[in-house]
């Protein structure tokens, strides 16, 4: 019980996680004018991943692609691949992840490969909250070299004729989104791999155990069973689809009831 | 304050090559690129090409391509301008100009930034 | 490459006036283009970047319109040291071309 609510939380986690990383992809406000030396202005001006918006005075908000001419900032095409390849990931993950889930049967598959699809889905999960992570920090870290560049040459004198101010950016909420769902997806792929390790079925040894019937011995194979007997061993951990029970000399008798538990 | 400063007139025989620098002051010199703009008396204004300095990528007008080789140097903060071959159509005042874009990621591009402009004279 | 004609090569314009000057490409450059002045003695100013947007420091009095291919700068109220000559330049696809410049002078 604990393990489906572990996995199935991780799920739900990774899922708003993942939805998390999209919304942020997706944004305008990765960076954001900052007001601070100039509240009242004519123009706000915000940018994302794919185009900047300037917000005038009006309302009127008019957003534009990148000038693409001379090439985008390596540190753009970083982050947005970090962001695409962690949707990419975790939208793998949550694919894998809905067939692992313990809650939902599908054939006869085993809790040994949904004990692996979990385990593949946190592993998808984690590095995709990574990446996202790994994204945000990599534009919060251009944006505050880009502040206080800015800060220091606040009063920039245009070839000596004009003072001007030089417009500086600060934190938009698109990095706080990314942050949160990266850590969010991180979270809950964490949580699926913990959930992993109670799917996964133990170890378990089994001996054969002999019953003398009229004249000749038939071994009693149970794979099946999960709990563990103590005695010998049954190293591959397989169910037992034999069709029966064989006797010692290999003669086939008659089907045992725990083939098919 | 942001300043490119430029480095003196230059008089040239034809067929000799010429180097002129740009001194760039202000400013982190690798944030932007540094154009180079051809001015022939009483003429207008002619884009010869662009250096990274970060990445040390040129783009050049296909006019001026063998005629022109850009440089810099981040360690002096200056961009570098060759021009060789020099023809009398090659006289005219050569200005370096940059684009301090005040956005993170540039949507745009400007020169807001421009040096006072090397004279060139070529003369036998 | 993209031709930036300024028709007028110079025009006389009374101080207080509301001056305009005109700028065509010979192919749609989607407003991506930019107005400088240059001074009689060669200082070259940006005024205006992408079609309409005034560059910080440049006074309201200048100001930028057009799309497609045909742009213009307008002068709201000229003032003395407005003399100078005026280019427009597109940055659509490379290389950036400049127009042949605007004279102006006050009558």
């Known amino acids: 019980m604990a393990v489906t609510a572990c996995q199935g939380l991780g799920f739900v986690v990774s899922l708003i996680g993942i939805a998390g990383i999209i919304a942020a992809t997706c944004m305008d406000q990765w960076s954001t004018q900052d007001l601070y030396n100039n509240p009242v202005t004519a123009v706000f001006n915000y940018q994302g991943l794919w185009r900047s918006c300037v917000r005038e005075s009006s309302g009127f908000t008019e957003c534009r692609g990148y000038f693409t001419l001379l090439g985008l900032p390596a540190m753009l095409q970083a982050v947005r691949a970090l962001m695409i390849v962690g949707i990419v990931l975790g939208a793998i993950g949550l694919l894998v992840s809905i067939f692992a889930l313990k809650c939902i049967r599908i054939g006869s598959m085993e809790d040994s490969a949904k004990a692996n699809m979990t385990l593949t889905s946190g592993i998808m999960f984690i590095v995709s909250g990574l990446c996202a992570i790994a994204g945000v920090s990599v534009f919060a870290n251009m944006l505050v070299t880009n502040f206080w560049m800015s800060t220091a040459n606040m009063y920039t004198g245009m070839g000596g004729m004009v003072q001007t101010v030089q417009t500086r950016y600060t934190f938009g909420a698109a990095l706080f989104v990314g942050w949160v769902a990266g850590g969010l997806t991180l979270i809950g792929g964490v949580m699926m791999c913990i959930a992993c390790r109670g799917l996964a079925p133990e170890e378990t040894n089994y001996k054969a155990v002999s019953y003398h019937a009229s004249g000749h011995s038939v071994a009693y194979k149970p794979g099946g069973f999960k709990a563990s007997t103590g005695f010998g061993s049954n190293t591959k951990n397989k169910k037992i689809y034999d069709g029966g029970a064989r006797t010692e000399d290999e003669v086939q008798s008659y089907p045992s009831k725990h083939d098919y538990v | 304050q942001v300043q490119l400063q430029q480095s003196g007139a230059e008089l040239a025989r034809p067929g000799a090559s010429v180097k002129l620098s740009c001194k760039a002051s202000?400013?982190?010199?690798?944030?932007?690129?540094i154009s180079w703009v051809k001015q022939r008396t009483g003429q207008g204004l002619e884009w010869i090409g662009e250096i990274s300095p970060r990445s040390g990528n040129t783009y050049y007008n296909e006019k001026f391509k063998g005629k022109a080789t850009l440089t810099a140097d981040k360690s002096s903060s200056t961009a570098y301008m060759e021009l060789r071959s020099l023809t009398s159509e090659d006289s005219a005042v050569y200005f370096c100009?940059?684009?301090?874009?005040?956005?993170?990621?540039?949507?745009?591009?400007?020169?807001?930034?421009w040096g006072t402009g090397t004279t060139v004279t070529v003369s036998s | 490459d993209i031709q930036m004609t300024q028709t007028t090569s110079s025009l006389s314009a009374s101080l207080g006036d509301r001056v305009t000057i005109s700028c065509r490409a010979s192919q749609d450059i989607s407003n991506y283009l930019n107005w400088y002045q240059q001074k009689p003695d060669g200082t070259v100013k940006l005024l205006i970047y992408y079609t309409s947007r005034l560059h910080s420091g440049v006074p309201s009095r200048f100001s930028g319109s057009g799309s497609g291919t045909d742009y213009s700068l307008t002068i709201s109220n000229l003032e003395p040291e407005d003399i100078a000559t005026y280019y427009c330049q597109h940055y659509s696809k490379l290389p950036p071309t400049f127009g042949s410049g605007t004279k102006l002078e006050i009558k």
């Open positions: 202000g400013y982190t010199f690798t944030s932007y690129g």
């Open positions: 100009a940059t684009g301090v874009i005040t956005t993170v990621i540039p949507t745009d591009w400007y020169f807001d930034v």
